[in-house]
């Protein structure tokens, strides 16, 4: 079997939800010694990057200028160390928003609630689009769809304080071209009285993984290293 | 605004050579990434050679040890030169860039490109 290095990671920086006109950052997360980075996108190669030097880096970013619906897909990285080719990273789906229209978002029975009520959100654009979302805020990998020819309708069931949180919805004109995003709708769930001091809130941070971690490998750690390497070699 | 200038096509014969040139209007070209694509009658428009801000270069497997892309940064310009020039290179060529880039990226599709020229017609027949 041909031999193949571990695939990188890819990550969109910051979000990957990219107003039109801006810039989405791609980071591929491969090797230190890497000399080459591929992005490709829907299949198709899209850019290369030879980082300089490439043993002082594990990574690199690509950026993506004047984002529209024609570079909204699919992207995945490889990278190349000597002649020998890495797997292909996951797929990262990068999606641009501020298409057309603003959907309106509305909660049923209101935006104030008890725990074990059923609640309802509904998100309503007069465009002509069928697909519709639903994202909570610090949560924007877990987005719910719905269908609808104007209006859609998101059931959550009977909520928790784990529902508490700030709601937004957009329509979609495909998977990866969205609306403007609706204006958040807060949903303040109560718990039983003597459970809502303890009721966990949403964490007010980013989502974890829209960070790019590359690092620049310094003198320092190539000292560690060596005498990690050195210090092998005795114990051996 | 970008504005992207080609020119130097014209009809060569097979074996020939070519230097096109792409003038760039702007104060953002030391900020761009250029590239060369080019349409053959009833084709689709194909990737030719691009290069980065800083000097690295990437070409189509078709081209590559003939033509050379190069930038002059003080003029505006990227060059493409072309050498042993065949039949199937003949081909209207665009010039394109992607402004504004803020790494080292060779951009090798032709949806990352967000200024085109009007493209220069080249012709190799015998």
């Known amino acids: 079997p041909k031999q193949t290095l571990p695939k990188p990671i890819i990550r969109a920086e910051s979000t990957y939800m990219v107003p039109k006109e801006k810039q989405a950052t791609l980071c591929c997360q491969g090797s230190y010694g890497a000399v080459e980075y591929q992005l490709h996108f829907e299949g198709s190669l899209f850019a290369v990057e030879r980082p300089k030097p490439p043993e002082r880096i594990n990574g690199v970013k690509f950026h993506i200028p004047d984002m529209n619906s024609r570079k909204a897909g699919r992207y995945s990285c490889i990278y190349r160390v000597g002649e020998l080719w890495s797997e292909r990273s996951d797929l990262l789906d990068l999606v641009v928003t501020e298409m057309y229209d603003t959907p309106t978002l509305s909660v049923h029975p209101g935006p104030e609630v008890t725990s074990g009520e059923k609640v309802t959100f509904y998100c309503r654009l007069d465009t002509a689009t069928s697909m519709f979302l639903l994202l909570k805020e610090g949560r924007s990998r877990d987005v719910q769809r719905s269908y609808g020819k104007v209006q859609a309708e998101f059931p959550m069931g009977p909520v928790t304080t784990a529902h508490r949180g700030s709601y937004r919805c957009f329509g979609s004109y495909n998977n990866y071209a969205w609306s403007f995003p609706s204006e958040p709708v807060k949903l303040l769930v109560t718990g039983d009285i003597e459970n809502t001091s303890l009721a966990p809130t949403d964490p007010t941070f980013p989502d974890s993984w829209d960070t790019c971690l590359l690092t620049r490998e310094t003198g320092l750690q190539k000292d560690l290293a060596l005498w990690d390497h050195t210090a092998q070699n005795l114990l051996r | 605004e970008v504005q992207l200038v080609e020119s130097g096509g014209g009809e060569v014969q097979p074996g020939g050579s070519l230097r096109l040139s792409c003038a760039a209007s702007g104060r953002t070209f030391a900020s761009a990434a250029m590239g060369w694509f080019r349409q053959a009658p009833g084709k689709e428009r194909e990737f030719v050679a691009a290069?980065?801000?800083?000097?690295?270069?990437y070409y189509a497997e078709s081209v590559k040890g003939r033509f050379t892309i190069s930038r002059d940064n003080a003029k505006n310009t990227v060059y493409l030169q072309m050498s042993s020039l065949r039949a199937e290179d003949t081909a209207v060529y665009y010039c394109a860039a992607v402004v504004p880039t803020y790494g080292n990226a060779i951009y090798v599709h032709s949806a990352a490109y967000n200024y085109w020229g009007q493209g220069t017609l080249v012709t190799v027949k015998p």
């Open positions: 290069i980065s801000r800083s000097d690295d270069t």
